[in-house]
């Protein structure tokens, strides 16, 4: 049986204020059943960055087409980067539960940091 892997290839992503950042995440299996969400930080205080199923995330867009079948690319773009956006971002697979989904596996995380302003 293929074990699900959450792949976040960049450990560090240097970004520029005002620009768009792309955070990559791919998975190796569609299983277990359940959604993938993006968070910044870990633990109970982590911040939800993107949930495709519900919520309003005006600065976030998906890299892959949302009508694509059997999608394994859960990468996102965050526009208009500000200093408040720095931190470590995790894509997290949840296992479908009733009534609550249960966290199943997290990617290793991508640290977003500010790079030097272009001169």
């Amino acid at each position: 049986e293929e074990e699900l892997q959450m792949i976040q290839p960049e450990k560090l992503l240097l970004v520029t204020v005002g620009k768009t950042a792309t955070l990559h995440c791919t998975v190796t299996s569609l299983l277990p059943v359940g959604p993938v969400l993006w968070f910044r930080g870990v633990g109970p205080g982590r911040e939800l960055i993107y949930n495709q199923k519900e919520g309003h995330f005006p600065r976030v867009t998906t890299v892959s087409d949302l009508t694509k079948r059997n999608n394994m690319d859960f990468s996102i773009r965050i526009s208009s980067i500000t200093p408040a956006d720095v931190g470590t971002y995790y894509c997290v697979k949840f296992r479908k539960g009733s009534p609550e989904n249960v966290e199943f596996k997290s990617g290793p995380g991508t640290e977003m940091a500010l790079g030097a302003k272009p001169s």
């Epitope: 569609l30 299983l31 199923k53 949302l66 859960f74």
Partner: antibody, heavy 120, light 108 residues
Framework: DVQLVESGGGVVRPGESLRLSCAAS????????MSWVRQAPGEGLEWVST??????YYADSVKGRFTISRDNSKNTLYLQMNSLRAEDTAVYYC???????????????WGLGTLVTVSS | EIVLTQSPATLSVSPGERVTLSCRAS??????IAWYQQKPGQAPRLLIY???SRDTGIPARFSGSGSGTDFTLTISSLQSEDFGVYYC??????????FGGGTKVEIK
């Protein structure tokens, strides 16, 4: 080409058991969820059960009586049906799940079905 | 459990006519609706997913629309091979997956 072939249907008495199988080919079986959907004679479609990896989901009408399982080494889906009732009489379809977007499952390929008749 | 209500139950139409089938959900399901066609003695066949995306190989005369609670499957010009029963299915909130009761499209 994706192919799903059900077997194991037949006529049983109330209270008896039956095991359905679904042989899958033409796709990477182990990475997809699989489901059973049934259709009573002259009636509409009713979802029965879905299996992911080892995560399983059941309709209330079969919970505790039916068990869904899979053998990825054999590309086969199973439905063990115990304590069968007259109202379980139906054609049972095996279906491959497909996702769209970041979650949400529907059924993109179906087998031809196998008929289960529960009658005394 | 989300209930899907399809209307009409039966539709008598002639080949070449435009056909509109309705599916109403008991609560908001966003665009998480699929449509299937089933001919007598055959398995269901996926037509539309995500409310409006045609499955591979489905003719352009089939189209889906709607979001929230009201959905429509349209056949722009009915062909003889389109007769059968059409079902909608929601996958927004499950278990259970639920299907509508079906609309039978028959020859006038």
């Amino acid at each position: 080409d994706v192919q799903l072939v059900e077997s194991g249907g037949g006529v049983v008495r109330p209270g008896e058991s039956l095991r359905l199988s679904c042989a899958a080919s033409g796709f990477s079986f182990s990475i997809y969820a699989m489901s059973w959907v049934r259709q009573a004679p002259g009636e509409g479609l009713e979802w029965v059960s879905t299996i992911g990896a080892d995560d399983t989901y059941y309709a209330d009408s079969v919970k505790g009586r039916f068990t869904i399982s899979r053998d990825n080494s054999k590309n086969t889906l199973y439905l063990q049906m115990n304590s069968l009732r007259a109202e379980d009489t139906a054609v049972y379809y095996c279906a491959k799940d497909s996702t769209v977007g970041w979650s949400g499952d529907f059924f993109d390929y179906w087998g031809l079905g196998t008929l289960v008749t529960v009658s005394s | 459990e989300i209930v899907l209500t399809q209307s009409p139950a039966t539709l008598s139409v002639s080949p070449g006519e435009r056909v509109t089938l309705s599916c109403r959900a008991s609560q908001n399901v966003r665009s998480d609706i699929a449509w299937y066609q089933q001919k007598p003695g055959q398995a269901p066949r996926l037509l539309i997913y995500a409310a409006s995306s045609r499955d591979t190989g489905i003719p352009a005369r089939f189209s889906g629309s709607g979001s929230g609670t009201d959905f429509t499957l349209t056949i722009s010009s009915l062909q003889s091979e389109d007769f059968g029963v059409y079902y909608c299915q929601q996958y927004y909130d499950w278990p259970p997956f639920t299907f509508g009761g079906g609309t039978k499209v028959e020859i006038k």
